[in-house]
């Protein structure tokens, strides 16, 4: 209109998809009368009546707006409900009384875009790559309006850089109106961008302010030539025979190259190369001395066919060879010397002991075991053991046994045994001497004999209990080419008189055993009586 | 429109050299990456090779040594190229593109069958 | 390597139905998993992406969900069209596929 004042900035109203609109309607009275306005939308220069207000009373015009206009505020104020992104655009209310005027009111939409989504390489990329590679990629969905993308390497914001850095972004309309921001980060990536993490952040706007929001962290495969490679040796530290041992090549490539592992003959000088097992690793299972020696690695890059050896690596397997003793079978009479001296090879210091095999005493530390005034007692097992005291279980040993020349010797004189008539008793004797005896018996029975060691003897006999044999009683006879000797049981009935309350009753075998190391012990199934120690 | 479409020999002997050719319409080679994917019959999909948008070339380690993939862009073409073939390398060859702003596949070639036999 | 793993092998439904399709991934891949339809003497064709977002043109009675290593694709209401092989697809870590679900009418 001629002469009319410039048209002052649209009222800006601002408003989530969704919500409710309200749009304040602000003539004031001196400009028009509120009870009689008419609402147009204006999209692309073209006014549409969406609503008129006749006195105070709303009425809404057919089309897109129908369903979602109402009254509030004694009419002054038009609410749009179920705001959309389409609804982006410029509302006026015109009065139609004094005269026409017009108030415009801009609404602006807006929409959080969904948390963003980040998807790295999954092939890796190589970081002699001829131009910037593609590294990740990342979505925000549904947002409104359009969300810029930042990306972030290590915590710092990346910036378009030629030929180093390119970010390509677009973004689509979904039928709804909002947009899905897609977004490649492109970059040449260096060894050192192995562990850097990478992720993007979507900035967008709402009625409340700035926001953002962002992705997880990822990290990015890089792939790097290998530059150096070496050995690993598990476990760490002095190895010993026995030991699982396991030697792999690593390199400081990705991807590793392919690795072989040779051991050098310590004849030819060559180096061979030894068979790994699936994952490349050398297993030594059970380690043997042979297994020492020089180790190296090779690895081989088959894109450049480049070859890389590492330094070779000594591997020394430590060992104790078999233990050797002199006299191997010792025989002396009583009363006289005997010197046991004991050897053996190792890859490390050895430290030597004696120890008595029946009772685990150390006898001497040290390789020489000197046993003078030979009783018979010290006839029996001696046991050198010959150890790496730097090297916890690596140890050999070698068991010895000294022969004492002498006639039987019983492990006891006599013996009471408490009997039931017409039982299976069960009974034992025991004796030693050099050379080792042999054992007989004065009655008729089962009897079995076992070698117990090279001096001693046990004999056992089963034999029904009968009215003669309590009369008689039970002998046992030892006898080798120096003497014989005899032990006695004598058999006693069981009756409540000698029962004592606290005794087993339980039925079953008599047993009646004894051993020059042990207290001598008669022993029943039905009552167990100490017996005083009888040696022969 | 996006197309993809394979050729190749069809049959090959044993011990020979495979040599497939995608070539695509619709899309440049500079803006998407394409990949190989193959099919025994009645078996599942195994991914072979793949080259990138930029030219970076990248292989299934278990074929890695008998694989070479490369492209002529002016030709719009992607060649792959695998040697000593054996009867389990039997299968339906597919060329996929991959989609400008993800890594799975948004449009996929007929497919070409190659037979390896004697 | 990461392994994909699809259930059921074979899965027989009429049409109208609504099924499920399963696939399990050997370790977490977050949300690097599409899903694709195969039919007779054809190319696969993509159908999800980034284990729920749909790709342009496919029906929207095509849906996917999950995360991290299990991952489903529904479909609500079969059509006679959807009898077909389904599978999925890791791209987390390298490609590798699940050895597929056959889809047979009843």
């Known amino acids: 209109v001629p002469g009319e004042a410039e048209q002052p900035a649209p009222e800006l109203v601002e408003v989530e998809v969704g919500s409710t609109a309200l749009l304040k309607c602000g003539l004031s009275q001196s400009q028009g009368n509120l009870s009689h306005v008419d609402w147009f939308s204006v999209h692309k220069e073209k006014r549409t009546l969406i609503f008129r207000v006749r006195q105070g009373q709303g009425q809404s015009e057919p089309g897109e707006y129908e369903q979602r206009l109402s009254l509030q505020d004694r009419g002054a104020t038009l609410a749009l409900t179920q705001v959309t992104p389409q609804d982006e655009r410029i509302f006026l209310c015109q009065g139609k009384r004094p005269r026409s005027q017009e108030y415009r009111i801009q609404l602006r939409v807006y929409k959080a875009p969904e948390e963003p989504n980040i998807q790295v390489n999954p092939l890796g990329i190589p970081v002699n790559s001829k131009e910037p590679e593609e590294v990740a990629t990342c979505v925000g969905r549904n947002g409104y309006p359009i969300p810029q993308v930042i990306w972030y390497k290590n915590g710092r914001p990346l910036k378009e850089e030629k030929n180093r850095v390119h970010i390509q972004s677009s973004q689509t309309v979904e039928s709804s109106g909002l947009y899905t921001l897609q977004s490649i980060l492109k970059a040449q990536l260096v060894k050192e961008d192995k562990d850097a993490q990478f992720y993007c952040e979507l900035n967008y706007r709402l009625p409340s302010g700035n926001h953002m929001k962002e992705s997880r962290e990822v990290t990015v495969p890089v792939f790097y030539p290998t530059e150096k490679v070496w050995l690993e040796v598990e476990p760490v530290g002095m190895l010993k025979e026995g030991d699982r041992v396991e030697i792999r090549c690593l390199a400081d490539g990705n991807p590793p190259p392919h690795f072989s592992i040779s051991k050098q003959n310590p004849s030819t000088r060559e180096a061979e190369e030894e068979t790994t097992n699936d994952n490349g690793v050398l297993v030594l299972e059970p380690a043997r001395k042979e297994h020492s020696g020089r180790y190296e690695c090779q690895g081989l890059d088959l894109d450049t066919m480049i070859s890389l050896l590492s330094e070779p690596q000594e591997l020394l397997v430590n060992y104790v060879s078999d233990v050797r003793v002199s006299p191997a079978a010792p025989e002396r009479q009583e009363g006289s010397s005997l010197t046991l001296t004991c050897e053996a090879e190792s890859s490390q210091d050895l430290e030597f002991q004696w120890l008595r095999e029946e009772t685990g005493q150390v006898l001497e530390r040290g390789p020489v075991l000197q046993l003078h005034d030979l009783k018979r007692e010290a006839g029996g097992g001696y046991r050198c053991v010959a150890s790496v005291p730097s090297i916890p279980g690596l140890n050999r040993t070698q068991l010895v046994n000294v022969a004492i020349f002498g006639p039987p010797w019983m492990a006891f004189k006599e013996r009471k045994v408490w009997v039931k008539e017409n039982m299976v008793l069960n009974l034992s004797c025991e004796a030693s001497g050099h050379p080792r005896p042999t054992i007989s018996w004065n009655v008729n029975g089962t009897a079995s004999e076992q070698d117990q060691d090279p001096q001693r003897v046990l004999s056992t006999l089963n034999v029904l209990v009968t009215p003669e044999l309590l009369e008689t009683g039970v002998e046992c006879t030892a006898s080798n080419d120096l003497g014989k000797n005899t032990s006695i049981l004598f058999l006693e009935l069981v009756n409540l008189t000698t029962l004592t309350p606290d005794s087993n009753t339980t039925t079953g075998l008599s047993t009646s055993t004894a051993s020059p190391h042990t207290r001598a012990n008669s022993t029943s199934t039905e009552r167990k009586l100490p017996e005083p120690e009888s040696r022969g | 429109q996006v197309q993809l479409k394979e050729s190749g020999p069809g049959l090959v002997q044993p011990s020979q050299t495979l040599s497939l050719t995608c070539t695509v319409s619709?899309?440049?080679?500079?803006?998407?990456?394409v990949s190989w994917v193959r099919q025994p019959p009645g078996k599942g999909l195994e991914w072979i090779a793949a080259?990138?948008?930029?030219?970076?070339?990248y292989y299934n380690s278990a074929f890695k040594s008998r694989l070479s993939i490369s492209r002529n862009t002016s030709k719009s073409q992607v060649l792959l190229k695998m040697n000593s073939l054996q009867t389990e390398d039997t299968a339906m060859y597919f060329c996929?593109?991959?989609?400008?702003?993800?890594?799975?596949?948004?449009?996929w070639g007929p497919g070409t069958m190659v037979t390896v036999s004697s | 390597d990461i392994q994909v793993t699809q259930s059921p092998s074979l899965l027989s439904a009429s049409v109208g139905d609504r099924v499920t399709l399963n696939c399990k991934a050997s370790q977490n891949i977050y949300n690097s998993l599409a899903w694709y339809q195969q039919k007779l003497g054809e190319g696969p064709k993509v159908l999800i992406f980034n284990a729920n977002s749909l790709q342009t043109g496919i029906p929207s009675r095509f849906s996917g969900s999950g995360s991290g290593t299990d991952f489903t694709l529904t479909i609500s209401s079969l059509q006679p069209e959807d009898f077909a092989t389904y599978f999925c697809q890791q791209f987390y870590s390298g490609y590798t596929f699940g050895a597929g679900t056959k889809l047979e009418l009843k």
């Open positions: 619709g899309f440049s080679l500079t803006s998407n990456g």
């Open positions: 080259i990138s948008s930029g030219g970076t070339t």
């Open positions: 996929a593109r991959r989609y400008g702003y993800g890594w799975y596949f948004d449009f």
